[in-house]
């Protein structure tokens, strides 16, 4: 069928396959060094690795990729790594009428798949 | 702020860039010969090209990702190009008790960007 | 590990002030804020307001606005909150907390039992 | 301010039946509430963030829904330490706002 499996063991060997992984940032690194004032660091969990054939397919679009990759590798990309959801973050930032604390939904990825 | 504009022109050049292409492919391209009918032949709107800094961001979380590609390109991937949207495609395929229509909403993408 | 240390418990007299102190160990202090929260004997929690160990710019509940002021120390880890014009509902345990990046925070000082009687 | 509502005041629970706490908030908080457990004489303990995830630590016998503003902490199977008084924290806007609490008594 149109949704076969995707396949959760990484063929490829420990830790190169796609995955989350914690990345430390300073807001320096992030460049909003000026306006956020806690926190001044941030774990940040991206989405690294391989995806190597029908390794944690996002979607039937994902399963078609990589089929047609394995046939046409020069025209078809392989899937790659990409969250598949995210962890909010509450930030503290300097505003014209004080501080405020805000929301960021889509910052800190919290699962990942190939797409 | 956290929401820097994501842009929009390829630095690239012509076509280098994350864009939606169409792809031909036959139902024994995707191993589906033996239970769909109809189409025979798809044509397949995949997600290709480099993803540039900022080009396209999907969001916060892949501007961060670009940033610190720039910073640390061992350790944290480049975005990469995935569809943002998808197309349904209706398909006819084979049931124990006929021919059935079904819809798949995630076969074909109709939009891509840089996550 | 993170750890938040806390002054140890004051009586004071109606009307006198109470400075109570946060000493941080277990992670760079100026990479966060730090909030005061209260808890008056059998009652609920309340939230006083926030310090960025950082930059110093503050936040604080509407209703203890002129009242309290918080600061904080870089050289020593340490914050500190200051209320003014006690008064016997002020009777509390007092509790510094820091900010994670997920709003909700493991990390709770002991608490500081402020007592106000005449 | 957003105000914090937990129902009920006082939960009388069996050991190794199931606990569960809501809490309402004035306005839509997104999913930005935190729930905590205090035992006498000892500081909060932080157990869910987010509505929903679990902080570091915690058994898998407590968790969280719920987003907007109707949210549920659920406590599988009460063990003889999840006696305590629960609260629940949002931290969607300033002033933070706690809910009065819900006390987990022994039946």
């Known amino acids: 069928s149109a949704h076969a499996h995707p396949r959760d063991s990484c063929p490829l060997g420990p830790g190169r396959c796609c995955h989350l992984e914690t990345v430390q940032a300073t807001l320096e690194d992030l460049g909003w060094s000026d306006w956020v004032l806690s926190p001044r660091q941030l774990q940040l969990s991206m989405c690294v690795g391989e995806c190597p054939h029908l390794y944690r397919s996002a979607n039937t679009h994902a399963q078609i990729k990589a089929r047609l990759h394995g046939l046409q590798p020069d025209k078809v990309p392989a899937p790659c790594c990409v969250p598949s959801s995210y962890t909010p973050v509450v930030l503290m930032h300097r505003t014209d009428s004080g501080v405020s604390l805000q929301t960021y939904d889509d910052l800190v990825a919290r699962g990942c798949h190939c797409a | 702020s956290a929401h820097a504009h994501p842009r929009d022109s390829c630095p690239l050049g012509p076509g280098r860039c994350c864009h939606l292409e169409t792809v031909q492919a036959t139902l024994e391209d995707l191993g589906w010969s033996d239970w769909v009918l109809s189409p025979r032949q798809l044509q397949l709107s995949m997600c290709v090209g480099e993803c540039p800094h900022l080009y396209r961001s999907a969001n916060t979380h892949a501007q961060i990702k670009a940033r610190l590609h720039g910073l640390q390109p061992d350790k944290v991937p480049a975005p990469c190009c995935v569809p943002s949207s998808y197309t349904p495609v209706v398909l006819m395929h084979r049931t124990d008790s006929g021919v059935s229509l079904q819809t798949y909403d995630d076969l074909v993408a109709r939009g891509c960007h840089c996550a | 590990q993170v750890q938040l240390v806390q002054s140890g418990a004051e009586v004071k007299k109606p009307g006198a002030s109470v400075k109570v102190s946060c000493k941080a160990s277990g992670y760079t202090f100026d990479s966060y804020g730090i909030n005061w929260v209260r808890q008056a004997p059998g009652q609920g929690l309340e939230w006083m307001g926030w310090i960025s160990a950082y930059s110093g710019d503050t936040a604080y509940a509407q209703e203890l606005q002129g009242r309290v002021t918080m600061t904080t120390d870089t050289s020593t880890s340490t914050a500190y909150m200051e209320l003014r014009s006690l008064r016997s509902d002020d009777t509390a345990v007092y509790y510094c907390?820091?900010?994670?990046?997920?709003?909700?925070?493991?990390?709770w000082g002991q608490g500081t039992l402020v007592t106000v009687s005449s | 301010e957003i105000v914090m509502t937990q129902s009920p005041a006082t939960l009388s629970v069996s050991p190794g039946e199931r606990a569960t706490l809501s809490c309402r908030a004035s306005q839509s908080v997104s999913s930005n509430l935190a729930w905590y457990q205090q035992k006498p004489g000892q500081a909060p303990r932080l157990l869910i963030y987010g509505a929903s995830t679990r902080a570091t630590g915690i058994p898998a016998r407590f968790s969280g829904s719920g987003s907007g503003t109707e949210f549920t902490l659920t406590i599988s199977s009460l063990q003889s330490e999840d006696f305590a008084v629960y609260y629940c924290?949002?931290?969607?806007?300033?002033?933070?706002?706690f809910g009065g609490g819900t006390k987990v008594e022994i039946k």
């Open positions: 907390v820091r900010d994670t990046q997920y709003g909700g925070s493991p990390y």
């Open positions: 924290q949002q931290y969607n806007n300033w002033p933070i706002t």
